[in-house]
Interface confidence: low
């Protein structure tokens, strides 16, 4: 239904707190360099304006679109060109081009310092003094570093943050209460960020149809008792919600997501028997809970997939009459039978089925041609299954840090031209798949591993797009989203790469490394490992292990020495010499 004032409508639907939080996220994601105070001022102005529109929808400018209102606000910021360069050119355009321009200038890797968590006591003090401002800072800092973070989910994580602080700040030992809990929220939020970025990439590069296919597969796995019409309705609504969030329409997105949660809770009988617990929760928790609800029990009497999609004499007729519906039904039927497959794999199978019908339905004897299609799925299914087994075995043998190092070597060999920080970040993230997925029951490993890897590799592609340096990476990132992971897995050592010359300073360390937190130490060591591989791309695993063990021993010795500086300056050059010899 049309509203005289869109901003009044959203303010009323969302309530002041959500409205302000979402506007703050939107501004922080568009203008990533502005301070919290600058954004907070804009948010207050927008909120005050929204309130005037609530009081009188026909007041001046209340009928303007949200893009116009928000864009005008952003374009009125002083020193926009000095701080944001060519982004200021967006302000010369009219809507909807202006918003598109803003979206194109979102930076997936902004040059902002890492978000450092304050010390527990200081955090609790500022939280108690003004919880609203404290939460505002959290939303601002996360949103500007993750310009595609799913806004209603970010409100949920802020809620988690708030609850943890409320609980832990009342404890005697605040630090030991806060640290593990906030680490947990941070880990989940980072995974949420890369997953959502993948959804936005799918939408941006391949359109709504591609996202809807993803949604049909995912929803069919989760709700195998829902019929195809129900799944299609949910997929359509979910596509709209994600399109809005990816497009910067955060108020509409949050509002529609709340509507979708409401619909699901009102229609549990036709969707799933597992929703009640989620539906008993307040809004933000409810929507989050529904997004990761456990799979419903599969119906016991599902017929074999072949009946309708291989053996039926009308296959080509049904396909020709309504291609999208027929393929959608295939994806639905296959997915509801396979909660143990990744969405990426299910989409590859649907693509294979589509290609087979395109080819076979044009032939003289279609049934003879497409009759073996299900058997042809076998290699497509075996490949990711083998990937999971191999990698989980390696993870169990090496542990997370060792597994990250193995991946770092592998990916540096595949794409040695990529910058070392990007390779280290990617390897560390890819390596976390072990901890995240390999401990799960067998039937949950494949979907966990492959869909997580796909999301991480999407980030690799986005960073590489900014400064393309590797033909290997360009090749894998140019193809379809679902083929990326198999493409990266299949890459071997880049034979075109000319090894970097050995620079002693790359492997020279100082005593300040001793006081770094464990994570930072690991990053330093992994940076050295990537540089070693760039110097010797064909070094054996044994050679690299020797060097890294020597390096670890050197750090251990010098960090325990009475005179650390002397130890580093005398033992360091010896280490460099030994490294060169070991890799000769």
């Amino acid at each position: 239904e049309a509203h005289k004032s869109e901003i009044a409508h959203r303010y009323n639907d969302l309530g002041e707190q959500h409205f302000k939080g979402l506007v703050l996220i939107a501004f922080s994601q568009y203008l990533q360099k502005c301070s919290y105070d600058e954004h907070a001022k804009l948010v207050q102005e927008v909120t005050d304006f929204a309130k005037t529109c609530v009081a009188d929808e026909s007041a001046a400018n209340c009928d303007k679109s949200l893009h116009t209102l928000f864009g005008d606000k952003l374009c009125a910021i002083p020193n926009l060109r000095e701080n944001y360069g060519e982004l200021a050119d967006c302000c010369t355009k009219q809507e909807p081009e202006r918003n598109e321009c803003f979206l194109q200038h979102k930076d997936d890797n902004p040059s902002l310092p890492p978000f450092e968590r304050p010390e527990a006591e200081a955090m609790c003090t500022s939280f108690k003094e003004n919880p609203t401002t404290f939460m505002g800072h959290y939303l601002h800092e996360v949103a500007r570093r993750h310009p595609y973070f799913y806004a209603p989910e970010l409100l949920y994580y802020a809620e988690q943050y708030n609850e943890i602080l409320t609980q832990c700040c009342a404890e005697a030992d605040k630090e030991s209460c806060l640290t593990p809990k906030l680490d947990g929220v941070k880990e989940k939020a980072l995974v949420s960020s890369v997953r959502q970025r993948m959804k936005c990439s799918s939408m941006q590069k391949f359109g709504e149809r591609a996202f809807k296919a993803w949604a049909v597969a995912r929803l069919s796995q989760t709700f195998p008792n829902a019929d195809f019409a129900e799944i299609t309705k949910l997929a359509t609504d979910l596509t709209k919600v994600n399109k809005e969030c990816c497009h910067g329409d955060l108020l509409e997105c949050a509002d529609d997501r709340a509507e979708l949660a409401k619909y699901m809770c009102e229609n549990q009988a036709t969707i799933s028997s597992k929703l009640q617990t989620c539906c008993d929760k307040p809004l933000l928790k409810k929507a989050h809970c529904l997004s990761e609800v456990e799979h419903d029990t599969m119906p016991a009497d599902l017929p074999a997939i072949a009946a309708d999609f291989v053996e039926d004499q009308e296959v080509c007729k049904n396909y020709a009459e309504a291609k999208d519906v027929f393929l959608g039904t295939f994806l639905y039927e296959y997915s509801r039978r396979h909660p143990d497959y990744s969405v990426s794999l299910l989409l590859r199978l649907a693509k294979k089925y589509e290609a087979t019908l395109e080819k076979c339905c044009a032939e003289a004897n279609p049934p003879a041609c497409y009759g073996t299609v299900l058997a042809e799925f076998q290699p497509l299914v075996e490949e990711p299954k083998n990937l999971v087994k191999t990698n989980c075995d390696l993870y169990e043998k090496l542990g997370e840090y060792g597994f990250q190092n193995a991946i770092l070597v592998r990916y540096t060999q595949k794409a040695p031209q990529v910058s070392t920080p990007t390779l280290v970040e990617a390897a560390r993230n890819l390596g976390r798949v072990g901890t995240k997925c390999c401990t799960l029951p067998e039937d949950q490993r494949l979907p966990c591993v492959e869909d997580y890897l796909s999301a991480i590799l999407n980030r690799v592609c986005l960073l590489h797009e900014k400064t393309p340096v590797s033909e290997h990476v360009t090749k894998c990132c140019s193809g379809s989203l679902v083929e990326r992971r198999p493409c990266f897995s299949a890459l071997t050592v880049d034979e075109t790469y000319v090894p970097k010359e050995f620079k002693a300073e790359t492997f020279t360390f100082h005593s300040d490394i001793c006081t770094l937190p464990e994570k930072e130490k690991q990053i330093k060591k992994q940076t050295a490992l990537a540089e070693l591989v760039k110097h010797k791309p064909k070094a054996t695993a044994e050679q690299l292990k020797t060097v890294m063990d020597d390096f670890a021993q050197f750090l251990d010795t010098c960090c325990k020495a009475a005179d650390k500086d002397t130890c580093f300056s005398t033992e360091g050059p010896n280490l460099v010499t030994r490294c060169k010899d070991a890799l000769a």
Epitope: E16, Q17, V54, E159
Partner: nanobody
Framework: EVQLVESGGGLVQPGGSLRLSCAAS????????LAWYRQAPGKQRDLVAR???????YYADSVKGRFTISRDNSKNTLYLQMNSLRAEDTAVYYC??????????WGQGTLVTVSS
């Protein structure tokens, strides 16, 4: 969390009026929607009226034109002005707060009896 305390209930004759109040305390900054629900003996709890932080209101059909919901943000108080009361309005009236950062909160309820 948000704590809610209702007051103003009591016995009233058909056609009479009552004003219910609900005082909110705790993390009141996080409240976005306030509402009144009621539960008659042996029945489920039903929404009577709600008001968003933007001031927009909603009323159940059975009370439209007779009841008015309002809020005073400076006092963190919600009100329900009930006019032309009928026997079927007899129920325990509950104050409800939906919050951005916390689970929803309910008051303990105040009894309204309409009888001659």
């Amino acid at each position: 969390e948000v704590q809610l305390v209702e007051s103003g209930g009591g016995l009233v004759q058909p056609g009479g009026s009552l004003r219910l109040s609900c005082a909110a305390s705790g993390s009141t900054w996080s409240i976005n929607t306030l509402a009144w629900y009621r539960q008659a003996p042996g029945k489920q709890r039903d929404l009577v009226a709600r008001i968003s932080s933007g001031g927009s209101t909603y009323y159940a059909d059975s009370v439209k034109g007779r009841f008015t919901i309002s809020r005073d943000n400076s006092k963190n108080t919600l009100y329900l002005q009930m006019n032309s009361l009928r026997a079927e309005d007899t129920a325990v009236y509950y104050c409800y707060a939906q919050s951005t950062w916390y689970p929803p909160s309910w008051g303990q309820g105040t009894l309204v009896t309409v009888s001659s």
